[in-house]
Interface confidence: low
């Protein structure tokens, strides 16, 4: 498992809530947490860091303390849309597909 980092300081405040620190690498676009160190996925996303799209669902329902909207994610033509790279990997487009740059300790096409 990747390292968990706990930060006690309140970095920003919103409605007097002290946000929790999610698992390192948890997707900022598709993940959230309710306990420190966890990474829970919005609908339509899966994987340990919520970076893998679920092909059977294209809708997402943002949850968590700052949710404001609900909508459907329509996958675009870009191979990196939704970031197919797991575990904090970084996606770059190639002519026919995508390439993941994996953080230390992770390997494979999608850093899994």
């Amino acid at each position: 498992d990747h390292h968990h980092h706990h930060h006690e300081q309140k970095l920003i405040s919103e409605e007097d809530l002290a946000p929790l620190v999610c698992r390192a690498g948890c997707s900022p676009e598709h993940g959230f947490c309710e306990q420190p160190g966890e990474c829970r996925c919005l609908e339509g996303w899966t994987g340990p860091l919520c970076t893998v799209p679920v092909s059977t669902s294209s809708c997402l329902s943002p949850r968590g303390p700052s949710s404001a909207t609900t909508g459907c994610l329509v996958p675009g033509p870009g191979p990196c849309d939704g970031n197919p790279c797991a575990n904090g990997g970084s996606c770059s487009e190639t002519p026919r597909s995508f390439e993941c740059t994996c953080p230390r300790g992770f390997y494979g096409l999608r850093c899994e």
Epitope: H3, L11, P19, G64, G82
Partner: antibody, heavy 120, light 106 residues
Framework: QVQLQQPGAEFVQPGSSVKMSCKAS????????ITWVKQRPGQGLEWIGD????????KSSEKFKNRATLTADTSSSTAYIQFSSLTPEDSAVYYC?????????????WGQGTTLTVSS | QVVLTQSPAIMSASPGEKVTITCSAS?????IHWFQQNPGTSPKLWIY???YLASGVPARFSGSGSGTSYSLTISRMEAEDAATYYC?????????FGGGTKLEIK
């Protein structure tokens, strides 16, 4: 509190090299990408590249790939960008940025920027 | 490469006026992020993930859009809103910014 500290200014001569620093504090430096952004006087923002300090992995714009070198020292929580063969066109403000996120929150922290002046 | 085109490049608005700045992407992106920059200062994250206001951003700001068309709206312009606004996409490499919209107060 998440902070990125950058030197205010660097003055160098054309043809020389420069290494600018970005010292991070207040978060797990190794686990979040650092981005470098260039802004020429009166111009817009230009993405240079990203570095993942935990592994040293980098992604750079084709324009800067051969001229800018991104590195990070996890022991001092400092990211660096080094330019070689400087020209006056490299004169700009260079920002480092950390996208730090947790829960449904983004905390996108920018350094104050280093103003690089390349002049003889 | 995803090219982001902002319009207008420069605009002015009177206090209380509704303002809309658009950001058009050359191909579909998942989200757009908006930054505000005042002269001589670092850009600040203003709206993230298309529609979420960053901490401290007044509620008169809003963001919307999907696919290739995004916008930032100010319901009622105030003097402190005068600044340059940039959109950015992080869906693919290379990361790209829009050219910026300079918003002035009349």
């Amino acid at each position: 509190q998440v902070q990125l500290q950058q030197p205010g200014a660097e003055f160098v001569q054309p043809g020389s090299s420069v290494k600018m620093s970005c010292k991070a504090s207040g978060y797990a430096f190794s686990d979040y990408w650092i981005t470098w952004v260039k802004q020429r006087p009166g111009q817009g923002l230009e993405w240079i590249g990203d570095i993942y300090p935990g592994s040293g992995s980098t992604k750079s714009s084709e324009k800067f790939k051969n001229r800018a070198t991104l590195t990070a020292d996890t022991s001092s929580s400092t990211a660096y960008i080094q330019f070689s063969s400087l020209t006056p066109e490299d004169s700009a403000v260079y920002y480092c940025v950390s996208l730090y996120y947790y829960g449904s929150y983004y905390l996108d922290t920018w350094g104050q920027g280093t103003t690089l002046t390349v002049s003889s | 490469q995803v090219v982001l085109t902002q319009s207008p490049a420069i605009m002015s608005a009177s206090p209380g006026e509704k303002v809309t700045i658009t950001c058009s992407a050359s191909s579909s992106v998942t989200y757009i992020h908006w930054f505000q920059q005042n002269p001589g200062t670092s850009p600040k994250l203003w709206i993230y993930r298309t529609s979420y206001l960053a901490s401290g951003v007044p509620a008169r700001f809003s963001g919307s859009g999907s696919g290739t068309s995004y916008s930032l709206t100010i319901s009622r312009m105030e003097a402190e809103d005068a600044a340059t606004y940039y959109c950015q996409q992080r869906s693919s490499y290379p990361r790209t910014f829009g050219g910026g919209t300079k918003l002035e107060i009349k």
